[in-house]
């Protein structure tokens, strides 16, 4: 058993049929010694008396808010949550496995640049009695500070018969060094509590591996005289790290016909312009990627050929 | 060439070679063998290799002030990785395919380090760690880890030379 926060405790249980459970001793936070009784949740049934209460925690019915009283007055509360371990593996019932980029990916994170700011998000089908708490650091043995905001509900989607809820959080490394080569990964830890179930989820990454630039901006076409060719030009996104002579991007320019089956013409360039043939009803798209490190491509910025 | 005592390197040549190194490091990575282990192996090896750190002067301001600190750090790393790529980790079982980009990568590391340091002058180099893989699966794991950290190292080096070529070239 360990303390999650003041008066909230997590009991770790091996979860299998007829498991013996864990013996837990609760102590009433009071100078009083006599006449103390204990109850669980809203029930008025007295579970025991005395300054301490010993319980055998085996299932969710044994978890909840234990209260000690004296003469009708509440002295203190202890909320017990359960953390299940099945066959040596902690349960992951609350969050949905996003399966990208690999199985058992519950948290996904992205950064728009090297400033040390990043966003993480996760999915659940649970709509009520759900709380999240997020902590982060650079490295784990001698952790350096990363400050995270509160997790917020950022999207709701309908998936078949189920509703899916997306939560996200923004974090910022306290003393980021954008030009350095990271040697210690960022650790993100999410505590999830649904009713009386506690779970924790972690992700470990380097900012360089979660970089996804915003799409190029100001995408423009300039027809070339007496030709079907056009000059496409664009600019670095505002959110990308500066100076651009140091934090350089590379670009992919694509000409795509109306039908998805039509052959795509692609050009790769380090410049912020390219000359392509503009077909009728086609569109021109440009996306960006770090020039020197193959992290994610940005989403496409597009303009119609006409 | 980065002649000791403060004269500039051939920024444009270094830029071209470092960008080639980036491409090679990424093309070599998936080719060192099928690898599930990389998903589970933790990042402890990163403690054993030289990193371009915050105080090394490899940021745009540091380069403007005095690029020598940064160039020395890059040179150290290049020599270090060149030694690793020539070690038993890459030459031992399982054998690399004859056309593996690791050979080209090895040669290019040496080429860039020579551009930075002419014959007759020696910057201090870092000792190559004893990673002591005794099993082929351990070598395979180390190859992945070394190439992963090399990708990060050469990305910073390429940024340095790109910025130098754009802003510090005579």
């Amino acid at each position: 058993i360990w303390e999650l926060k003041k008066d909230v405790y997590v009991v770790e249980l091996d979860w299998y049929p007829d498991a013996p459970g864990e013996m837990v001793v609760l102590t009433c936070d009071t100078p009083e010694e006599d006449g103390i009784t204990w109850t669980l949740d809203q029930s008025s049934e007295v579970l025991g008396s005395g300054k301490t209460l010993t319980i055998q925690v085996k299932e969710f019915g044994d978890a909840g808010q234990y209260t000690c009283h004296k003469g009708g007055e509440v002295l203190s509360h202890s909320l017990l949550l359960l953390h299940k371990k099945e066959d040596g593996i902690w349960s992951t019932d609350i969050l949905k496995d996003q399966k990208e980029p690999k199985n058992k990916t519950f948290l996904r994170c992205e950064a728009k640049n090297y400033s040390g700011r990043f966003t993480c998000w996760w999915l659940t089908t649970i709509s009520t009695d759900l709380t999240f708490s997020v902590k982060s650091s650079r490295g784990s043995s001698d952790p350096q500070g990363v400050t995270c905001g509160a997790a917020t509900l950022s999207a709701e989607r309908v998936r078949g018969d189920n509703k899916e809820y997306e939560y996200s959080v923004e974090c910022q490394e306290d003393s980021a060094c954008p030009a350095a080569e990271e040697s210690l990964p960022i650790e993100v830890m999410v505590d999830a509590v649904h009713k009386l179930k506690y779970e924790n989820y972690t992700s470990s990454f380097f900012i360089r591996d979660i970089i996804k630039p915003d799409p190029p901006k100001n995408l423009q076409l300039k027809p070339l005289k007496n030709s079907r060719q056009v000059e496409v030009s664009w600019e670095y996104p505002d959110t990308w790290s500066t100076p651009h002579s140091y934090f350089s991007l590379t670009f992919c320019v694509q000409v795509q016909g109306k039908s998805k089956r039509e052959k795509k013409d692609r050009v790769f360039t380090d410049k912020t312009s390219a000359t392509v043939i503009c077909r009728k009803n086609a569109s021109i798209s440009v996306r960006a990627q770090d020039r020197y490190y193959s992290s994610s491509w940005s989403e496409w910025a597009s303009v119609p050929c006409s | 060439r980065a002649v000791p005592g403060g004269s500039s390197p051939a920024w444009t040549q270094c830029q071209q070679l470092s960008q080639k190194l980036c491409t090679l490091a990424w093309s070599a990575h998936p080719l060192v063998g099928h690898m599930d282990l990389r998903e589970e192996g933790d990042e402890e090896t990163t403690n054993d290799v030289p990193h371009i750190q915050c105080g090394d002067g490899c940021d745009p301001q540091g380069l403007r002030d005095n690029s020598q600190f940064c160039l020395q750090r890059i040179h150290q790393g290049l020599i270090f990785y060149e030694k690793l790529l020539g070690s038993d980790i890459f030459t031992g079982e399982p054998s690399l395919l004859p056309d593996s980009p690791v050979g080209q990568l090895h040669a290019s590391l040496l080429g860039l380090s020579q551009l930075l340091q002419p014959e007759g002058h020696h910057w201090e180099t870092q000792q190559i760690p004893s990673l002591s893989p005794s099993q082929p699966w351990q070598r395979l794991l180390l190859r992945f880890k070394i190439l992963r950290s090399l990708q990060a190292f050469v990305a910073v080096a390429a940024r340095v030379f790109a910025h130098g070529a754009a802003t510090l070239s005579p």
Partner: antibody
Framework: QVTLKESGPVLVKPTETLTLTCTVS????????ISWVRQPPGKGLEWLGV???????NYNSGIKSRLTISKDNSKSQVVLTMTNMDPVDTARYYC???????????????WGQGTTVTVSS | DIVLTQSPDSLAVSLGERATINCRAS??????????MHWFQQKPGQPPKLLIY???NLESGIPARFSGSGSRTDFTLTISSLQAEDVAVYYC?????????FGGGTKVEIK
């Protein structure tokens, strides 16, 4: 499908040399390492040695001086030679494939049925 | 050599009950976060069969009631609900250092 089959003498006299052949099918010896493991009657398993994909070998230090493992990739055969046999070498000898280096980390994923070798005069 | 000590030597469990076998190594069998510990099942007259590789990965075709956990020096094989066909001897094996070594085996029987 993947198979490994051991063949060789059933009975060997003390001081003689044992030669066992393992013939494999369903995979190539250029892609997988082969180990030899033995099991004395009613006892546990003992690893003898391995031949890697490139032909290099590692042996159990306890019997290294008596053991040679070689292979012929084109014939899909691995040969174990063990000199100066003794009654304590009486065991079932298994030829075993080591799983893909990058996934299995030295786990042996396919075993032959084994061949029982008795050392007796 | 790395010595692997299995416990218990034998285990009698009722059908449908849980069986747990431990394997302790004389030194760590982890290499940069990878545990080179594997589990085998051997039935009478048959060669051993790989169940779990790298401490916790279920070999294809093996029922999900088998699971493995642990790292460094302490490892566990669990059969969550014992079936009649699980009666066998179970061995752990390390491949972190030469020579590869096996545990002494744990015999699992039905109570």
């Amino acid at each position: 499908q993947v198979t490994l089959k051991e063949s060789g003498p059933v009975l060997v006299k003390p001081t003689e040399t044992l030669t066992l052949t393992c013939t494999v099918s369903g995979f190539s010896l250029t892609n997988y390492a082969i180990s030899w493991v033995r099991q004395p009657p009613g006892k546990g398993l003992e690893w003898l040695g391995v031949i890697w994909t490139g032909g290099g070998t590692n042996y159990n230090s306890g019997i290294k001086s008596r053991l040679t493992i070689s292979k012929d990739n084109s014939k899909s055969q691995v040969v174990l030679t063990m000199t100066n046999m003794d009654p304590v070498d009486t065991a079932r000898y298994y030829c075993v494939r080591e799983g893909d280096y990058g996934s299995y980390a030295g786990a042996m994923d396919y075993w032959g049925q084994g061949t029982t070798v008795t050392v007796s005069s | 050599d790395i010595v692997l000590t299995q416990s218990p030597d034998s285990l009698a469990v009722s059908l449908g009950e849980r069986a747990t076998i431990n394997c302790r190594a004389s030194e760590s069998v982890d290499y940069y976060g990878i545990s080179s510990m594997h589990w085998f099942q051997q039935k009478p007259g048959q060669p051993p069969k790989l169940l779990i590789y790298r401490a916790s990965n279920l070999e294809s075709g093996i029922p999900a009631r088998f699971s493995g956990s642990g790292s460094r020096t302490d490892f566990t094989l669990t059969i969550s609900s014992l079936q009649a066909e699980d009666v066998a001897v179970y061995y752990c094996q390390q491949a972190n250092k030469d020579p590869y070594t096996f545990g002494g085996g744990t015999k699992v029987e039905i109570k």
